[in-house]
Amino acid sequence: SGTTNTVAAYNLTWKSTNFKTILEWEPKPVNQVYTVQISTKSGDWKSKCFYTTDTECDLTDEIVKDVKQTYLARVFSYPAGNVESTGSAGEPLYENSPEFTPYLETNLGQPTIQSFEQVGTKVNVTVEDERTLVRRNNTFLSLRDVFGKDLIYTLYYWKSSSSGKKTAKTNTNEFLIDVDKGENYCFSVQAVIPSRTVNRKSTDSPVECMGQEKGEFRE
């Protein structure tokens, strides 16, 4: 049969950050091509990445339709140049992915401190509300729009002259913290979804310190 040298895809893996979602698999194709299908548990299969020699497929457009749904994908293998050929059972070879629920599993991207402003002994630190590819009414939603109060930020802040990191938390994108007058502080933030058991935390934002250009000081 024409599928003698066709091998099924394996190691199907979801790679997803802030809902940008790519399915990856192995092996690199030799004389074969792949097509991916994706479906919700109760929905119909939709084909993507037709007859590709890539070993990844961007499924963001599909999963952002409803990030709380659970998705399943499958990767079909076809002989190169003979995509009509099927396996011995009359079906092309395919492998299923693990199930994937974007809302529960997408990784949280590295946050960014947008600004900080000192007024006397208080500092207001603002975290950038990153835009996602999730849409509602033709507009892209921010991470906060999607997760609401499920998403919190932890602020680590410390005197430039000391090593101990104090923490503050918010379920908005703003912190208001007390600082000692005349001291310079550094800041880093982490996104957290406390209700999760996996992929709970982002990596830390780049550190920003007072005396650098993102900050503003007012008496």
Epitope: T154, K166, T167, A168, K169, S188, P194, R200
Partner: antibody, heavy 120, light 107 residues
Framework: EVQLVESGGGLVQPGGSLRLACAAS????????IHWVRQAPGKGLEWVGY????????YYADSVKGRFTISADTSKNTAYLQMNSLRAEDTAVYYC?????????????WGQGTLVTVSS | DIQMTQSPSSLSASVGDRVTITCRAS??????VAWYQQKPGKAPKLLIY???FLYSGVPSRFSGSRSGTDFTLTISSLQPEDFATYYC?????????FGQGTKVEIK
Amino acid sequence: EVQLVESGGGLVQPGGSLRLACAASGFTIGVYIIHWVRQAPGKGLEWVGYIDPSNGYTYYADSVKGRFTISADTSKNTAYLQMNSLRAEDTAVYYCARDDQSVSSPFDYWGQGTLVTVSS
Amino acid sequence: DIQMTQSPSSLSASVGDRVTITCRASQDVNTAVAWYQQKPGKAPKLLIYSASFLYSGVPSRFSGSRSGTDFTLTISSLQPEDFATYYCQQHYTTPPTFGQGTKVEIK
């Protein structure tokens, strides 16, 4: 099942050192914050310090700063409290606790505690 | 550091009594207050978080409330297993601080 188990307590002379361990199971310490809290005999709870194992950040109570060090080994899923220059007033049951890192950050799981006695 | 002033330090009550314990924060801590129960020789157990939310598995006779910087733990009908020491804790800012504790004893 989430569990924290402390070990390493015992009798130590003033000025001595001790290392306590907090072994976690049922969750990954790398995505939580781990605190150490102590309780002197017949007294209330006193916070000692925390570590965020994801970045190594720590903070300590003034009473232990410079003497105690918290660390974590995520491959062993264990946090540690290294206690140096111990004093009689460090005598206490030492607990580790998990911080769920929500906005109010309650300590949702605690270990059973390990007794440290500093005495000559 | 934020001080959490807890009162009373001890109280005597009977089974079925309504018991109220209060904690006052020395400055604003929003709702970042938890309440714990501790029995002799045991680790503390979380009862209430975010000032008024009942932790999973905790009986509904326990409740928490907030009025400004004053926080209250109420046991609506004291049960034999509720005789213990109770602590409030703020974690609005580092370092987190505990109240001095309230020992609930049998009258």
